[in-house]
């Protein structure tokens, strides 16, 4: 047989969940177990993703859609479609090649994933440090020392002026 497409392609009639079987005069055959085709007119079905090891099944494979995986507890997804699972760390840590390590002084991580980031430099905005940073939390910046006149609140900064076209945050 000829394995190329003709102008009037009989395979276009094959629905999702089937493949166009060249060995049987291009009839539509069901996808074999553990495979799927999510669109019509397919020449072969695709292998269902298997959620093994650190992956666990979030959605089972069907004849028309692939399985979807997420990660077992203690791990989180990375990449498109959860292509990788990465170990969780505690807040205040980051994952290195040698495992979870505490954030260096001056950095923090408030999540179980990702890297430690530097504390905000309040002075760059002309502000002062209101609450010191920790390994788990960024510093909280307050008004500049000059704004702290007697009687002024040291916690609530003055409300910014509303600009046209901007919603309140």
């Amino acid at each position: 047989f000829e394995r190329t497409r003709s102008l009037q392609d009989p395979c276009s009639n094959c629905p999702a969940g089937t493949f166009c079987d060249n060995n049987r005069n291009q009839i539509c055959s069901p996808c074999p177990p553990n495979s799927f085709s999510s669109a019509g007119g397919q020449r072969t079905c695709d292998i269902c993703r298997q959620c093994k090891g650190v992956f666990r099944t979030r959605k089972e494979c069907s004849s028309t859609s692939n399985a979807e995986c997420d990660c077992t507890p203690g791990f989180h997804c990375l990449g498109a479609g959860c292509s990788m699972c990465e170990q969780d760390c505690k807040q205040g840590q980051e994952l290195t090649k040698k495992g979870c390590k505490d954030c260096c002084f001056g950095t923090f991580n408030d999540q179980k994933r990702g890297i430690c980031r530097p504390w905000t430099n309040c002075s760059l905005d002309g502000k002062s440090v209101l609450v010191n940073g920790t390994k788990e939390r960024d510093v909280v910046c307050g008004p500049s020392p000059a704004d702290l006149s007697p009687g002024a609140s040291s916690v609530t900064p003055p409300a910014p002026a509303r600009e046209p076209g901007h919603s309140p945050q």
Epitope: T4, N34, Q42, R43, T44, I47, C48, Q50
Partner: antibody, heavy 117, light 105 residues
């Protein structure tokens, strides 16, 4: 339908090599493709599979992390990038097309890889 | 999934009926078979357990289910001398049997 492998040769252990498979006579982009190998005087061993759109890729445990299968549908070509080669990778390497029942319905003539110091 | 193929060597006279077997370590949906002669690429021979590939003589047949599959030649001919490999694909990607070499006396 024709499949023609190329790129085999003699490589030292730890070395790298890239095999190619040129396809013609069918709509290459519609079909999953495989690499299968056969060591001298031994049986057939499946190596890797790539789906038609490259969204599903599988490897045999023996090559995972060392071999990479890829394809260029615009050029009707299948590739196998091999790194950290070992003497046990010495074999005839065949490319083969995938049928809907997941068997290998067309095979190339093969290209020989020899890994030896 | 591991496939155990037997016998390793099968010797038969022309006209004889022969059967070779593949057993899978767990249940599979289909078994496929290939014929390979020395110096040549494998040829698809039987697919999806019982369907003959294009050009395969009708004296060949395939059967089986679950974990046990077989290829039978009703009347062996000299041109059938070759090594036959079974292959499965189920949930684990692809594995082959170790091959049965059919020799003609």
């Amino acid at each position: 339908v024709q499949l023609q492998e190329s790129g085999g040769g003699l490589v030292k252990p730890g070395g790298s090599l890239k095999l190619s498979c040129a396809a013609s006579g069918f709509t290459f982009s519609d079909y999953g493709m495989h690499w299968v190998r056969q060591a001298p005087e031994k049986g057939l061993e499946w190596v890797a599979y790539i789906s038609s759109g490259s969204n599903s890729i599988y490897y045999a445990d023996t090559v995972t992390g060392r071999f990479t299968i890829s394809r260029d549908n615009a050029k009707n070509t299948l590739f196998l990038q091999m790194t950290s080669l070992r003497s046990e990778d010495t074999a005839m390497y065949y490319c083969a097309s995938n049928n809907g029942y997941f068997y290998f319905d067309y095979w190339g003539q093969g290209t020989t890889l020899t890994v030896s110091s | 999934i591991v496939i155990t193929q037997s016998p390793a060597i099968l010797s038969a006279s022309p006209g004889e009926k022969v059967t070779m077997t593949c057993r899978a370590s767990s249940s599979v949906s289909y078994m496929h078979w290939y014929q390979q002669k020395p110096g040549s690429s494998p040829k698809p021979w039987i697919y999806a357990t019982s369907n003959l590939a294009s050009g395969v003589p009708a004296r060949f047949s395939g059967s089986g289910s679950g974990t046990s599959y077989s290829l039978t030649v009703s009347r062996v001919e000299a041109e059938d001398a070759a090594t036959y490999y079974c292959q499965q694909w189920s949930s684990d990607p692809f594995t082959f049997g170790s091959g049965t070499k059919l020799e003609i006396k």
